[in-house]
Interface confidence: low
Amino acid sequence: AVDLTLLANLRLTDPQRFFLTCVSGEAGAGRGSDAWGPPLLLEKDDRIVRTPPGPPLRLARNGSHQVTLRGFSKPSDLVGVFSCVGGAGARRTRVIYVHNSPGAHLLPDKVTHTVNKGDTAVLSARVHKEKQTDVIWKSNGSYFYTLDWHEAQDGRFLLQLPNVQPPSSGIYSATYLEASPLGSAFFRLIVRGCGAGRWGPGCTKECPGCLHGGVCHDHDGECVCPPGFTGTRCEQACREGRFGQSCQEQCPGISGCRGLTFCLPDPYGCSCGSGWRGSQCQEACAPGHFGADCRLQCQCQNGGTCDRFSGCVCPSGWHGVHCEKSDRIPQILNMASELEFNLETMPRINCAAAGNPFPVRGSIELRKPDGTVLLSTKAIVEPEKTTAEFEVPRLVLADSGFWECRVSTSGGQDSRRFKVNVKVPPVPLAAPRLLTKQSRQLVVSPLVSFSGDGPISTVRLHYRPQDSTMDWSTIVVDPSENVTLMNLRPKTGYSVRVQLSRPGEGGEGAWGPPTLMTTDCPEPLLQPWLEGWHVEGTDRLRVSWSLPLVPGPLVGDGFLLRLWDGTRGQERRENVSSPQARTALLTGLTPGTHYQLDVQLYHCTLLGPASPPAHVLLPPSGPPAPRHLHAQALSDSEIQLTWKHPEALPGPISKYVVEVQVAGGAGDPLWIDVDRPEETSTIIRGLNASTRYLFRMRASIQGLGDWSNTVEESTLGNGLQAEGPVQESRAAEEGLDQ
């Protein structure tokens, strides 16, 4: 976390003496563009808590890593949210301080609440000056909840927020209805992005176990230590009056850190300095308590005394957080009784020991079964133990057996034996088996007999086209399941090999023998023929085709339709990707064009024989739609249509086409020709009684024109079922546009 502290001086008898200081322990902090990073920023944040405007606050930079805000003229200037921003680039961090008026109607029992994702947060506003009105809770300035005034419990209004999530973080306030917002109790809720003791993107990593009230950062897993503590786990207390990540900063003034609130980067929040508590951080810890806000209890044993800044001070012969550990002969700690490694790996083995005098790196050694003694390459010294790390030379099978960790100090010695099992990574003895094949995929059984040790943790299948020098493709599969190699090339030989792995570092075995597997792809042999086609517009053609009936499954992936425009020397190709399709609508064609059309079946990249070609003439673009189409029922089987000729005709109309459809019906519509283009009305006969019909029409010159509006009309009364609609006296069959 960024070493950034926002200090608030809470000696509030005189607002003019109030100040905020932001201190950065980062290299180059606050120097601006002439150094490593942007300057420290310290400002009042008026977005949520707005106060009456006053004279501007004064910002003073004190050296390279400190900035101070002064110039508060009245108590209301202090109320609200202040923030300090420091650090460069991705490490840029904002530290927030929330100030409550000591004379407010409601005061927070605790200003900063840091909780884990999924926890229940309880904000408690203590009644300082009672008003008999409802209490409004707000979250980030927006209304959240109302409590009746008589619902105070033990003089407190509680807001319970169960199962909190990170978006619930922010500034909360409790205000009496119709009271000044300056009399509110302001809170800061920080919700860590993970559950307790976890950090990382999926909250999969375990926190180091921060001590002394330190809080584990949910992004990087580091402990944000309370003011007055340091170390990776906040295990070390600073000297009284010191703070910062390395205890490098000193509290100003003769009374040390008394009266100062310390705010640190989230998820820590704010607290008093070590040894102090109370709303203004002016009260020393009660006996037996220590640390920030005096939240920690000493519980010293064996004659230890409690120091309110650092905790238990142990008498000679004892150590530990509570002086519970005797200075004693060395002891090997938490050594596993059995370890397992893979052949030819170079593992690191840790051995931890404690004692007095404290074990150092050279006092811990590791002995192999053959008597070879290894010395540690690195030691991690912690307050309660030393952990020696041994880099083991490349393991051979003879290294299996009992190893021994030994610690020796002037206080005595201790040793612990543990078993090391050296395992041989598995190697397949046979090639994988082909189960089924298709044109673009192979189904393979990957698990084969193997030499070496199990259990098998992963199976990798490596494959590439035969005789290829390209990289192998790899797929990791479940050992118990067959695997399908997808997206392969048809009619291609593939070299396929298996690699097995067992658990642990270096558990991957050598690749097994290769085998050749070939994808399938028979050539399509069926020749389709064109059944028919009809023009659906000046640029649209509906084509249908058939295939000869043959036993067995259809070998084909789809159809390719080809349209050849000989005049322009252009070919249009239309892919129909379903082998079941027998019709297609071709759109976007050129009106008035002569096309040669054929269709062929394809399979993989192979084309079957083309159908005999057909010649199609698309009509030129047709006339505009007829106008004012109207339908009028004449009887139980006749409806009269009337219309007006299209406007702006490019030539004489050759005919009209009427479309008839039963309203709501699922069948195809009927098309009926009106061959007397001078007419503006016609009678459709042979309709069913009491039936609703839809009509529309279009004109034809050289090609069919646009459809008119659709009109709807019902035939009258009850009559016999008709054979089908006809126009005038001509049979419908004659007039259908095929």
Partner: antibody, heavy 119, light 110 residues
Framework: EVQLLESGGGLVQPGGSLRLSCAAS????????MQWVRQAPGKGLEWVSS????????YYADSVKGRFTISRDNSKNTLYLQMNSLRAEDTAVYYC????????????WGQGTLVTVSS | QYELTQPPSASGTPGQRVTISCSGS????????VNWYQQLPGTAPKLLIY???QRPSGVPDRFSGSKSATSASLAISGLQSEDEADYHC???????????FGGGTKLTVL
């Protein structure tokens, strides 16, 4: 005068769905926590679900979790309960009720709507 | 089935004092307020007592509530015929994040 009026109940087959509504009037709806409580024929009351004033926080009884969804439209002063995968044991009169702050008491109740789940 | 335990029935004569008990556990009554609801025949429940012993406006002072450790009780003095109803106790349960109810007590005025 505070009024809560439920609607949307009826007969539904097991596995079916229903959506209950509760129209609120006579108070500032957007300020109150609301809940659904049900009462099986001849039985006691059973809390079903609660929703915070903003609509952003919801809670459910274990017996309905994953099947029922509570929601609210503050602009329409209406509370909803979407009930899916209904079972015979969901048969009950469903009441909507207004929450009364930290006391967690329900100070006003609707007249209820009967949901019958039967084949 | 019900987290809180109430006697299924109680009775008294007009003018008498009747007490209805309600027992729970540390996660509900033990750490939260108790509320009582009155449900007249064929009607919706009505809040009778909240926060253990508080009466909403309009509720006669003949009704009183109390709580001790993990149990609570509702007392009705000067029993009247219109008090014949079902009485339900309820308390928030921290482990459920929701309220739990008793099975209800049917009060008969003899």
């Amino acid at each position: 005068e505070v009024q809560l009026l439920e609607s949307g109940g009826g007969l539904v087959q097991p596995g079916g769905s229903l959506r209950l509504s509760c129209a609120a009037s006579g108070f500032t709806f957007s300020r109150y926590k609301m809940q659904w409580v049900r009462q099986a024929p001849g039985k006691g009351l059973e809390w079903v679900s609660s929703i915070y004033p903003s609509g952003g926080i919801t809670y459910y009884a274990d017996s309905v979790k994953g099947r029922f969804t509570i929601s609210r439209d503050n602009s329409k002063n209406t509370l909803y309960l979407q009930m899916n995968s209904l079972r015979a044991e969901d048969t009950a009169v469903y009441y909507c009720a207004r929450g009364r702050g930290t006391t967690r008491a329900f100070d006003y109740w609707g007249q209820g709507t009967l949901v019958t789940v039967s084949s | 089935q019900y987290e809180l335990t109430q006697p299924p029935s109680a009775s008294g004569t007009p003018g008498q004092r009747v007490t209805i008990s309600c027992s729970g556990s540390s996660s509900n009554i033990g750490s939260n307020n108790v509320n009582w609801y009155q449900q007249l025949p064929g009607t919706a429940p009505k809040l009778l007592i909240y926060s253990n012993d508080q009466r909403p406006s309009g509720v006669p002072d003949r009704f009183s509530g109390s709580k001790s450790a993990t149990s609570a009780s509702l007392a009705i003095s000067g029993l009247q015929s219109e008090d014949e109803a079902d009485y339900h106790c309820a308390a928030w349960d921290d482990s459920l994040n929701g309220p739990v109810f008793g099975g209800g007590t049917k009060l008969t005025v003899l």
